[in-house]
Interface confidence: low
């Protein structure tokens, strides 16, 4: 499929001008190659009318130009003094006319309306309101006022001052007679339809002395704004329909076959399943404007989108609308990254997030998509050292591996962590990407004790058991804080006995804290990595208490877990007597008290080899 994109249809009137924008992927070659505009012939050829190399056909002499904007990846063809002879099929393209790097454009030039003398022209957008003003003389002040529409050869009554309203206008038209001082009546038509366009006649009086005024109503269908975005990237539709519809339900829909427009999202809570996890409808401003963000763009997202306002939350005749034609460029600069990551309860995931490598200094963010209230994405962590309170000790955003990718690690997984997450930066907003975390059946791979208590001034040894599948990985211990996880020295204690059917390649790696101080309290992670690519992690919380008896502590898997009645305070908010643990997604289910769960019982993410779009926590 050609990556060149432009308007499919351009409509204008004789004597007017058009401006046609064509988009291309802004690669180095494309930026400098020849751009052209040609007219397709009946036998299939395409005759150049204008090109970026200076050629202008005699048909276009003095009335057309072509301008390239290499930094935007666009070029613009302007054509003036249009005539009906200009109607036809054209191509805008790159390189040689016959090579196929082009886009088909249909140009339709129609004859201007043949208007009667003294005709007032009203040009109004579809769905909006028009007020047709009708002056009259004093002698007709007390006489019947009426508005007719010319249908073929005959005028058809639309509304009059005796109370008649044509059924086609019911509920959206009124006739206002101004105060006695003004010799004027007005007809106001709301929610304009395309079928309302045409010639109107307003009249005061019915005899030969009646006053008449001609009006021509042109109802404009909005020209779609062209939007050219990369596959896997994101798009934002900004919709400003005006303050008069500020309190009316808003929608974004995608045109399917014919006139159907399938709702993508609306303010009444409807959302198309295909956009689950990757769409936000931003809150409205006071003037009723709003925007819709769609991430993780797919080929099938391409098409015509309309935003509008209607009490039903969907497109109806007379809805004020805005339109966009979205083209999804498959020659994307955004790299493939897994769209699904799988982990097990108690385990972990490591998510790779792409960003624009030109913006390495931008702030990186990770947020959790929520479907409530038209979609929202509360931030969970950023690269500036901020972590949402309920995620302390189990979430970290790392700048590694760098060069266009950062890593997010989430451990102590529960079923409530399943969902859609967005990677984003404060730089290039087109580089928002979406990943779905799925929680699957299984046991964590890494085994660590539960929460551990250390004694002030003594030595603490905490074990982490690595199965043989990680024999070739670098194993580490680190202390978690808001800015990341600071590596600590650890000792390889030889093969682990924690795994059944696992050979000598399994490993027990211990963290030793000598002369424990209050500052040692906190979250510790053990994990595996390969170079700058992180795999699975497991977390353990170390509490520090006063000395009771001398000696050092060597914690085993069995004895480190908190007893059911033991009071354990940690930054995951394990509550007294294990009654409730603060859960980051508590309000998603509107529970009164969260379920008890083990805070730190190891980590694992499985790798699903069935799809290149899926990633496990240790897929490296």
């Amino acid at each position: 499929k050609s990556p060149i994109f432009g308007p499919e249809e351009v409509n204008s009137v004789e004597g007017n001008s058009v401006s046609i924008t064509c988009y291309y992927p802004p690669t180095s070659v494309n930026r400098h190659t020849r751009k052209y505009w040609c007219r397709q012939g009946a036998r299939g050829g395409c005759i150049t009318l204008i090109s970026s190399e200076g050629y202008v056909s005699s048909k276009y002499a003095g009335r057309a130009n072509l301008t390239n904007f290499p930094e935007n990846g666009t070029f613009v063809v302007n054509i003036a003094q249009l005539s009906q002879d200009d109607s036809g099929r054209y191509k805008c393209g790159l390189g040689i006319n016959s090579r196929g790097l082009s886009f088909d454009v249909s140009l339709e030039v129609s004859q201007g309306p043949g208007l009667l003398n003294d005709t007032k022209v009203y040009t109004v957008d579809l769905g909006r309101t028009v007020t047709i003003n009708c002056p009259f003389k004093t002698e007709n002040a007390q006489k019947r006022k009426s508005l007719y529409k010319q249908i073929g050869l005959y005028p058809v009554l639309v509304i009059d001052s005796s109370g008649y309203v044509n059924p086609n206008y019911t509920g959206r038209i009124r006739l206002d007679i101004q105060g006695t001082g003004q010799l004027l009546f007005s007809v106001v038509i709301n929610q304009l339809r395309l079928s309302d366009a045409g010639q109107y006649l307003c009249q005061a009086g019915d005899d030969s002395n009646s006053n008449k005024k001609n009006a021509d109503l042109q109802v404009l269908k909005p020209e779609p704004e062209l939007v050219y975005e990369d596959l896997r990237g994101s798009v934002t539709f900004h919709c400003a329909l005006g303050p008069e519809v500020a309190n009316v339900a808003k929608f974004l829909c995608r045109q399917s076959s014919g006139e159907n427009c399938d709702v993508v999202v609306n303010t009444l809570g409807k959302r198309a399943p295909a956009f689950e996890g990757r769409i936000l409808l931003n809150p409205q401003d006071k003037d009723g404007s709003f925007s819709v963000v769609i991430t993780g763009l797919r080929k099938e997202d391409a098409g015509r989108y309309l935003c509008g306002a209607h009490s039903d939350g969907q497109l109806q005749e007379g809805s004020p609308i805005q339109a966009w034609q979205l083209f999804v460029n498959e020659e994307s600069t955004i790299p493939r990254s897994p769209t699904v990551v799988k982990g097990v309860a108690g385990g972990s995931v490591a998510v790779l997030c792409p960003y624009n490598r030109k913006e390495s200094k931008s702030i990186k963010y990770w947020c959790l998509w929520e479907g409530a209230q038209n979609g929202r994405c509360p931030l969970l962590v950023d690269s500036e050292g901020w972590v949402k309170a309920q995620y302390e000790g189990r979430l970290s955003l790392l700048e590694e591996p760098g060069n266009g990718t950062f890593t997010v690690i989430l451990n102590q997984l529960t079923s409530r962590d399943a969902g859609f997450y967005w990677c984003l930066t404060n730089g290039d907003t087109l580089w928002r990407t979406t990943v779905e975390i799925k929680i699957i059946e299984g046991e964590p791979n890494l085994k660590v004790p539960g929460n551990v208590t250390a004694v002030l001034g003594e030595t603490l040894k905490v074990p982490c058991h690595f199965p043989c599948k990680f024999s070739s990985y670098e194993k580490y211990w680190c202390k978690w804080n808001n800015t990341g996880c600071q590596a600590l020295p650890s000792q390889d204690e030889g093969p682990s006995k924690a795994f059944v059917n696992c050979d000598e390649n399994s490993r027990l790696v211990s963290l030793t804290l000598n002369l424990v101080t209050r500052a040692d309290e906190g979250w510790y992670w053990c994990g595996v990595k390969q170079g700058h690519f992180y795999g699975e992690t497991a977390a353990v919380y170390v509490a520090v208490e006063e000395r009771k008896a001398a000696g050092s502590r060597d914690v085993s898997l069995a004895k480190a877990d908190a007893a059911p009645d033991e009071k354990v305070l940690d930054s995951g908010f394990r509550e007294i007597e294990n009654k409730a643990i603060q859960d980051p997604r508590l309000f998603a289910e509107e529970k009164a008290v969260a379920d008890t769960r083990d805070q730190a019982d190891g980590s694992r993410a499985s790798v699903d080899s069935g799809s290149s779009e899926e990633q496990g926590g240790s897929s490296r």
Partner: nanobody, 124 residues
Framework: EVQLVESGGGLVQAGGSLRLSCAAS????????MGWYRQAPGNQRELVAR???????IYTESVKGRFTISRDNAKNTVYLQMNSLKPEDTAVYYC??????????????????WGQGTQVTVSS
């Protein structure tokens, strides 16, 4: 700049009552969950109570039946009514809110903000 300002703390005798307030100031489009946390000397900060935008609530076990959290969405304010106070309730109380500031140029992303804290001392 978005800020949370707490008020209502002070010294009270055991069995007494206090009402804490926390108001958000600055340019805010929307407020999501709001809550109160506390930190006693030598302890970690712990959840006291949280309230969702739809007014669903959660309390830590030790304050259930004594403390009530409420909110006024129009004023972006959260309250904590504390009755039957005990000496072990002595702590610095922090307000926390998940808010969408209107100056977030890069999109529609809530993040949480913390107040400076207000001291509550319960004497026996």
């Amino acid at each position: 700049e978005v800020q949370l300002v707490e008020s209502g703390g002070g010294l009270v005798q055991a069995g007494g009552s206090l009402r804490l307030s926390c108001a958000a100031s600055g340019s805010i489009l929307s407020t999501n969950d709001m809550g109160w946390y506390r930190q006693a000397p030598g302890n970690q900060r712990e959840l006291v109570a949280r309230i969702s935008r739809g007014s669903s609530t959660i309390y830590t076990e030790s304050v259930k039946g004594r403390f009530t959290i409420s909110r006024d969405n129009a004023k972006n304010t959260v309250y904590l009514q504390m009755n039957s106070l005990k000496p072990e309730d002595t702590a610095v109380y922090y307000c926390n809110a998940d808010m969408l500031p209107s100056d977030l140029s890069h999109g529609y992303y809530y993040r949480d903000y913390w107040g400076q804290g207000t001291q509550v001392t319960v004497s026996s």
